[in-house]
């Protein structure tokens, strides 16, 4: 049930605290005009409230934030400092904003945010340092373990450099803030899904080896042949499905089979079933790490359209002779 | 080119179970996924689930798990669907199609009557 | 489950006219979207899939747009033949979920 709006939730009030005989009452915690706030449970909702910033009277016992469906534009260095600091949010959810900054240092002094959820905000402007909190080369560990960033590229007309060059600034710059600092050493799951994304910036894995979820679905990757899943030992969940995903070469597949405890979701695929996807329809037939992996099916070309990857055979994967190139036309 | 032939129209009492086959030609049977859709008299489509021939692999759609269950025999290039506990709620055009991405060859239908 | 909505369920057209069909999703299905086509005798026939791609020995007067929410299937210069209903489906999740169909009359 919803706690009632700016209400302060002491569990006595003072009247009656008063009236029990004690001394004086506990100082009642503040809750902002705009939020419902609960101490029992912890939590402070702002939601759908227009808010233009963050609250500054935020009670220092939070350990929920929802300051989702407002109207943020820019979360500026040391958005959420307070005195006393807020040492106890551990998740903190902005999705859904307006925003388009996030500057570096803007999660500063929270000391146990450990989820942190931007989702659905249009950042065109994400500091190499919103997470790491400061710019020198090794950071302070980051005490973050969830990072969502689901849909959070900006429509096409506001991103630099038009559709394609901008699409590689903005994989730049989340690549950037995921490594600035090695401050995301302990990131635990981090979801990129709805981005647009057409590669994956080659180092950030490398340099996240705690991940157990990976959520890269909804993207437009078409090859995953420069990244390496090699060193994510502990990854258990790999989720690539609605992407553009046309093989998987041995390479990507003798790393996947040799993570101990990975599944891997790939449905929504457009697989070319051609003679380059034999490797793949022999490692599906064998492993056990691919999820639903008989409802992967053929996409191109037309003639294998609907047909099952599993009920594949070597027959049924040629490759139309390249013509020399006197015979070809552009 | 693939081609559906289903089985012929039914009449059924109450509390019935009925068996309809769906028996694929023209390409690998066992390689596509069969799908089952419902059409009420005067309704639209109604996705019910469905079932890789090769694999024996199923997919129900919440809504008729108890009623339907799908089979498929690869030697024979069919697949089944039997629908129990038939209720006049079960009278319908049932359709198999060949599935995957999208449903690209259709069997003709099957009309089953449910009636006292 | 993903809501497949054709808001209008009937349609009166004369031959030769340009027809739109309208299909709208209930969340961002991509371009996981194909059209059917359902004869007067019961027969169903694949015309679009994935979107805008054209089923083999569709005639090309047929074409499918769209992307997210919001899909449409046109009849370029519409035929005797062209009477049917037409359908919407999804497969971007389990269940799958058709629409709830457009019926198309000749004026």
């Known amino acids: 049930s919803a706690p009632s709006s700016s209400v302060p939730s002491s569990s006595t009030s003072p009247a009656a605290f008063l009236a029990s005989g004690s001394a004086q009452p506990p100082p009642a915690e503040r809750c902002p005009a705009a939020c419902e706030c609960s101490e029992a449970a912890r939590t402070v909702k702002c939601v759908n409230r227009n808010l233009l910033e963050v609250p500054a009277d935020l009670p220092p016992y939070v350990r929920n934030l929802f300051l989702t469906g407002n109207q943020m534009t820019v979360l500026p260095a040391g958005a959420f400092a307070r005195q006393p600091p807020l040492a106890d949010l551990e998740a903190l959810n902005l999705s859904g904003n307006h925003l388009k900054e996030v500057c570096a240092g803007a999660f500063e002094h929270l000391p146990g945010l450990r989820r942190l959820d931007l989702s659905h905000n249009p950042l065109t402007n994400l500091s190499a340092f919103a997470f790491a909190g400061s710019n020198a080369s090794v950071s302070a560990p980051s005490p973050l373990e969830e990072l969502i960033l689901n849909h959070i590229v900006p429509p096409e007309d506001q991103r630099q450099n038009g559709s394609f060059e901008g699409m590689v600034a903005f994989e730049g710059m989340v690549a950037a803030a995921l490594l600035a600092g090695r401050a995301l050493q302990g990131l635990r799951r981090l979801e990129l899904a709805s981005n647009h994304f057409l590669y994956l910036p080659r180092d950030v894995l490398a340099q996240l080896p705690s991940l157990r979820h990976l959520d890269l679905s909804n993207n437009s990757l078409v090859s995953l042949t420069y990244v390496s899943f090699r060193n994510l030992t502990h990854l258990e969940s790999l989720h690539l499905e609605d992407n553009a995903l046309k093989v998987l070469h041995n390479g990507t597949l003798a790393e996947l089979q040799g993570l101990p405890h990975i599944r891997v979701f790939l449905d929504n695929n457009p697989w070319v079933c051609d003679c380059h996807m034999a490797d793949m329809v022999t490692w599906l037939k064998e492993t056990e790490v691919v999820q639903g992996k008989d409802r992967l099916t053929c996409a191109y070309p037309e003639k294998m359209r609907n047909r099952v990857l599993l009920e594949l055979n070597s027959a049924d994967l040629d490759c139309d002779p390249i013509l020399p190139p006197s015979l070809q036309t552009s | 080119q693939g081609q559906l032939q289903q089985s012929g129209a039914e009449l059924m009492k109450p509390g019935a179970s009925v068996k309809i086959s769906c028996r694929g030609t023209?390409?690998?049977?066992?390689?596509?996924?069969i799908e089952w859709v419902k059409q009420r008299p005067g309704h639209g489509l109604e996705w019910i689930g469905e079932i890789l021939p090769g694999i024996g692999s199923t997919y129900y759609n919440e809504k008729f798990k108890g009623k339907a269950t799908f089979t498929a025999d690869t030697s024979s290039n069919t697949a089944y669907m039997q629908l129990s506990s038939l209720t006049s709620d079960d009278s319908a055009v049932y359709f198999c199609a060949r599935g995957g991405r999208d449903f690209d060859y259709w069997g003709q239908g099957t009309t089953l009557t449910v009636s006292s | 489950d993903i809501q497949m909505t054709q808001t209008t369920s009937s349609l009166s057209a004369s031959l030769g006219d340009r027809v739109t069909i309208s299909c709208r999703a209930s969340?961002?299905?991509?371009?996981?979207l194909n059209w059917y086509q359902q004869k007067p005798d019961g027969t169903v026939k694949l015309l679009i899939y994935?979107?805008?791609r054209l089923h083999s020995g569709v005639p090309s007067r047929f074409s499918g747009s769209g992307s997210g929410t919001d899909f449409s299937l046109t009849i370029s210069n519409l035929e005797p033949e062209d009477i049917a209903t037409y359908y919407c489906?999804?497969?971007?999740?389990?269940?799958?979920?058709f629409g709830s169909g457009t019926k198309l009359e000749i004026k």
């Open positions: 969340q961002d299905i991509n371009n996981y």
């Open positions: 023209g390409y690998t049977f066992r390689s596509y996924w």
């Open positions: 994935d979107t805008s």
């Open positions: 489906q999804q497969y971007s999740k389990l269940p799958y979920t």
